[in-house]
């Protein structure tokens, strides 16, 4: 069923690919130590080598369901007509602590499966009670979850996940953390990590906003830590530009919701609308996103230590028509300092009793801040009242690169040698690879530099990961995996076309007068042995 | 299950301090998801907030306008209880008073004291 | 300071519905929660959040909240209905209590 490795690219040597002309993919993830890869698809699993050959696939699908059944038919007899259904796979999440995949995937109302990373081997079923189910949305790229290891020898693991909800807001919450046991037979597997009479660790689309507005969802598109928090880049319907009118225009927006790793009581929900623009032109729907480290010249640029966190974002233009956004689309930097500053000035200016909750989708009134003693540092992880807050002020990213033509649609980012290499994967299949530079000649924040072609056609989807070593890219669409080498310098057959590349990775080794990188070159430290510089072509 | 137990003197004499004490079972004083209220009923009918202490990695207190310059509530963490003290009283402190828990201002006095009838008379 | 004021009586015959209004500025803003006080006990907590029940309390209380007025409503009243409402909320760093209301069981 699923095709072996053959030849892709263009022009460059033969990248490998994974093909499965059967089962759309939809999910990638890399194993940090073995390089290994999984890919999460309709009714199948696999897992594949660092060289995209075929290990072992899993079944998962077609299954006999339907999405009326409540609980699923293999629990519960249904009224509702059984019929063979898709199993999308919609998470895919390495669980390392416990030698673990979570798989999630559309079938059974949304339930996971844990299978072993050896041989994908299914480890215990769910015990099929309400919190297993995260919701039947068939939509690949629209739930995102964070897995939380406990702390070593002792506490459990859980996992933060959003999915959106299709107005079923009586079964689904849209954001929820759940316990993850190491036995996956235990009871509580999936249990909420926190639930009394007034809290628990979810949260839920009111009833009275699907009444108000019966399309409104939430998407999460990605989400990540950073230090003690848990961050979600969403899209959801703007309930403040979108008429009630079913038949009316829909307009999204882009939110980052932020939550403390350890708030069981989702207390510390904060969520604040966000975008970039340039020229006038506003960027308001996000596509994808990647935290990174920023590398020594760029953090010097932003004013950051080289440890502190940065996100990458690709955000669509303008608001409306989230599943086909239009192709004109900008590279955006977010820093972490400057989103967690901007928070926390929202938080200590409501406990000083200034202004609104401004949550309308979740709160349907307008709550107003509550004045408190309080004391609101970096770590505050909020308190029973002044809760769930909402931002008013889009928090603006720096838009580094536009594209007007092919759209971006995925992203990636590393740094080498103290430099920071973006990849961004397009509409048309095509791999961008882009230096970041904020102090570039002519006031330009970044260089294409480079531009390969992953898949001819198919756009690229959002998990866009790199291998351990950082030597190749694995780039995916919806049906094939294609490893892509994170530079292809022995391209460039003379010091000029190579230097004149402004490929990173790339410098002129005399020894062989050949294009590599600085570690591919015998002696490249001695003098006059590897140029790494244009000018050094000449001296040459 | 939660439960509050009142203890302190029926009568104080006018100008002098009043003073009750709620011993928590079933929950912890320090809890940071509750806090532990103080409310009276005049004989008339009417409820009234006096105060609240609650523990957000240190110990806070809201008093209420009325009384805020003689009221203290004190948290007592080794003998999880907690106490109130209204200085100078008058007659028209007379009142029956609640220790009570909250689940935050949002979900209301969830779990209430017996409650203590007090007179101030000499 | 903030009021919330309520009609002092309301009588209803059993198994008819109740209506207790509260009102206050711009309460439709806050949450409002209601306390049933039964003669002779403390009172006992019966909605919060405008209309969410705590566990043990029967389906035929609810509550709603918008604009200056929240209301609670004892749907198919019985006997052992008939005590004191309170509607409360929070304002300025105070909870504030609603003047009451007797429900008489006719």
């Known amino acids: 069923e699923a095709g072996l490795p053959r030849a892709g690219g263009g022009s460059q040597p033969p990248f490998r690919t994974f093909s499965a002309s059967d089962w759309g993919l939809t999910h990638l993830v890399v194993h940090e130590q073995t390089g290994e890869v999984y890919v999460g698809a309709v009714n199948r699993i696999y897992k594949l080598s660092g060289n995209l050959t075929l290990l072992r696939a899993h079944v998962t699908g077609p299954v006999e369901d339907n999405e009326k059944c409540y609980p699923p038919p293999s629990v519960q007899s249904c009224p509702h007509g059984l019929g063979s259904t898709d199993n999308v796979n919609k998470l895919l999440l390495l669980d390392y602590a416990a030698n673990r995949l979570l798989a999630c995937g559309s079938a059974s109302q949304g339930i996971c499966q844990f299978l072993r990373l050896d041989d994908l081997f299914k480890l215990g079923e769910p015990h099929h009670r309400k919190e297993h189910y995260l919701s039947s949305v068939q939509e690949a790229g629209s739930m995102a979850g964070v897995l939380i290891a406990g702390p070593p020898g002792q506490g459990q693991a859980k996992l933060f996940v959003g999915t959106p909800i299709d107005g079923k807001s009586e079964y689904f919450p849209t954001l929820s953390s759940r316990r993850l046991m190491a036995n996956e037979e235990d009871a509580d597997m999936f249990g909420f990590v926190y639930q009394d009479e007034f809290v628990s660790s979810q949260l839920k689309i009111p009833s009275d906003t699907l009444s108000k507005f019966p399309a409104f969802d939430i998407y999460y598109v990605y989400s990540f830590r950073s230090e003690q928090f848990v961050y979600y880049l969403t899209l959801q319907l703007d309930t403040q530009l979108t008429s009630p009118d079913a038949a009316g225009e829909h307009f999204f927006t882009s939110k980052i919701v932020r939550l403390c790793v350890d708030d069981p009581k989702f207390y510390s929900y904060v969520e604040f609308p966000i975008g970039c623009e340039q020229a006038g032109v506003e960027y308001r729907l996000v596509q994808d996103a990647y935290l990174s480290r920023p590398g020594r010249a760029l953090a010097h640029q932003l004013g950051l230590a080289e440890d502190e966190d940065v996100l990458f974002t690709v955000f669509a233009q303008g608001q409306k028509n989230r599943v086909k956004p239009p192709k004109e689309s900008a590279l955006c930097l977010f820093t972490l300092r400057a989103i967690k500053e901007k928070i926390k000035e929202r938080i200590q200016s409501c406990y000083r009793g200034e202004g609104k909750l401004s949550l309308p989708w979740l709160l349907n009134k307008e709550l107003g801040c509550i004045n408190s003693p309080l004391q609101i540092d970096d770590d505050f992880c909020g308190q029973d009242f002044n809760q769930p807050l909402g931002g008013t002020v889009t928090i603006e990213g720096t838009p580094l690169f536009v594209d007007k033509d092919d759209g971006l649609t995925a992203v990636a980012a590393y740094d080498y040698r103290g430099r920071t290499v973006v990849f961004a994967g397009t509409r048309s299949g095509r791999i961008r690879k882009i230096l970041v530079d904020l102090s570039n000649p002519g006031g330009r924040p970044a260089l294409a530099y480079e531009s390969v072609v992953a898949q001819e056609g198919s756009p690229i989807l959002r998990d866009l990961v790199l291998s351990p070593n950082h030597q190749y890219l694995y780039a995916m669409t919806e049906k094939q995996v294609t490893r892509v080498p994170v530079e292809s310098c022995v391209q460039y057959t003379s010091c000029e076309l190579c230097l004149g590349s402004r490929d990173p990775h790339c410098g002129w080794c005399v020894l062989h007068s050949i294009c590599s990188r600085r570690d591919a070159c015998e002696r490249a430290d001695e003098p006059q042995r590897f140029a790494a510089d244009l000018l050094q072509c000449v001296q040459l | 299950q939660v439960q509050l137990q009142q203890s302190g003197p029926g009568l104080v004499k006018p100008s002098q301090t009043l003073s009750l004490t709620c011993a928590i079972s079933g929950d912890s004083l320090s809890s940071t998801s509750a806090a532990w209220n103080w409310i009276r009923q005049s004989p008339s009918g009417g409820l009234e907030w006096l105060g609240r202490?609650?523990?957000?990695?240190?110990?806070?207190?809201d008093y209420a306008v009325s009384v805020k310059s003689r009221i203290t509530i004190n948290p007592d963490t080794s003998k999880n209880q907690f106490s109130l003290q209204l200085n100078s009283v008058t007659p028209e402190d007379t009142s029956v008073y609640y220790c009570a828990r909250d689940r935050g201002y949002y979900n209301g006095v969830d779990v209430w004291g017996q409650g203590t009838m007090v007179t101030v008379s000499s | 300071s903030y009021e919330l004021t309520q009609p002092p009586s309301v009588s209803v015959s059993p198994g008819q519905t109740a209506s207790i209004t509260c009102s206050g500025d711009k309460l439709g803003d806050k949450y409002a929660s209601w306390y049933q006080q039964r003669p002779g006990q403390s009172p006992l907590l019966v909605i919060y959040?405008?209309?969410k029940r705590p566990s043990g309390i029967p389906q035929r209380f609810s509550g709603s909240n918008s604009g200056n007025t929240a209301t609670l409503t004892i749907s198919g009243t019985q006997a052992m209905d008939e005590a004191d409402y309170f509607c409360?909320?929070?304002?300025?760093?105070?909870?504030?209590f609603g003047t009451g209301t007797k429900v008489t069981i006719l």
């Open positions: 409360q909320a929070w304002d300025s760093g105070t909870f504030v």
């Open positions: 202490t609650y523990y957000r990695s240190k110990w806070y207190n």
């Open positions: 959040q405008d209309n």
